[in-house]
């Protein structure tokens, strides 16, 4: 089938990084500067993405692959292939239409992006708060009361095998 196809369509022989030039009797021509073709048999080359403004180049365009962008410091990528850059906030904040705002009491954000989330309600799992939450950090819930009783087993998961010569303590 491939052989038949190549006899019928000379363009199928053009490798990535070239295009099938109709103006030149369908011979394979290299992609012009600032363009690429990532697959063979292409009749045109695609224009390279340009990383401008708040975008910066993470990977240069080549004849066979598009440029890849990320965001300048203080911004982070959003969308497939970093199609947008969004402003960073500090931990303990979230981005609103009016800019970065501190998390309300009872909520936290431990990243420079995303929204403030409510502290975990430990009591829903029958646990109590071991470490209080802050704007930057969720609460830490202690173990369940059953884990603390005198009869509680020391081991939840099975213990890993020790190296020879090491006796358990």
């Amino acid at each position: 089938f491939e052989r038949t196809r190549s006899l019928q369509d000379p363009c199928s022989n053009c490798p990535a990084g070239t295009f099938c030039d109709n103006n030149r009797n369908q011979i394979c021509s290299p992609c012009p500067p600032n363009s690429f073709s990532s697959a063979g048999g292409q009749r045109t080359c695609d224009i390279c993405r340009q990383c401008k403004g708040v975008f910066r180049t993470r990977k240069e365009c080549s004849s066979t692959s598009n440029a890849e962008c990320d965001c300048t410091p203080g911004f982070h990528c959003l969308g497939a292939g970093c199609s947008m850059c969004e402003q960073d906030c500090k931990q303990g904040q979230e981005l609103t239409k009016k800019g970065c705002k501190d998390c309300c009491f009872g909520t936290f954000n431990d990243q420079k992006r995303g929204i403030c989330r409510p502290w975990t309600n430990c009591s829903l799992d029958g646990k109590s708060v071991l470490v209080n939450g802050t704007k930057e950090r969720d609460v830490v819930c202690g173990p369940s009361p059953a884990d603390l009783s005198p009869g509680a087993s020391s081991v939840t998961p099975p213990a890993p095998a020790r190296e020879p010569g090491h006796s358990p303590q």
Epitope: T120, L130, V131, V139, V140, C141, P143
Partner: nanobody, 116 residues
Framework: EVQLVESGGGLVQAGGSLRLSCAAS????????MAWYRQAPGKQREFVAV???????KYGDSVKGRFTISRDITKNTVDLEMNSLKPEDTAVYTC??????????WGQGTQVTVSS
Amino acid sequence: EVQLVESGGGLVQAGGSLRLSCAASGAIFSYNGMAWYRQAPGKQREFVAVITPDGTTKYGDSVKGRFTISRDITKNTVDLEMNSLKPEDTAVYTCAALRNSGSTSWGQGTQVTVSS
């Protein structure tokens, strides 16, 4: 399920020091907290110390100023430095990986005995 293995326990005289270490099979910063608990025979398990992913620490009242919890994220270990040990510190010390949702993972524990 993370697996935790404690080491460093032993017999020590009152006023002495020990350093316990807890080696975790998984990334310790993925838990809400890594903690040490202790349990004396016939008693309830008692909170000793905890360290959160951002490095915040908290201590049980009976060990404040004497014990220090620390961690090494690259080695996935959590250590407990115990100074000015007292006979009442005698217990099995157990490392715990705390999850806000889900069960706590426990190590096997290491025995600490402080003689007077």
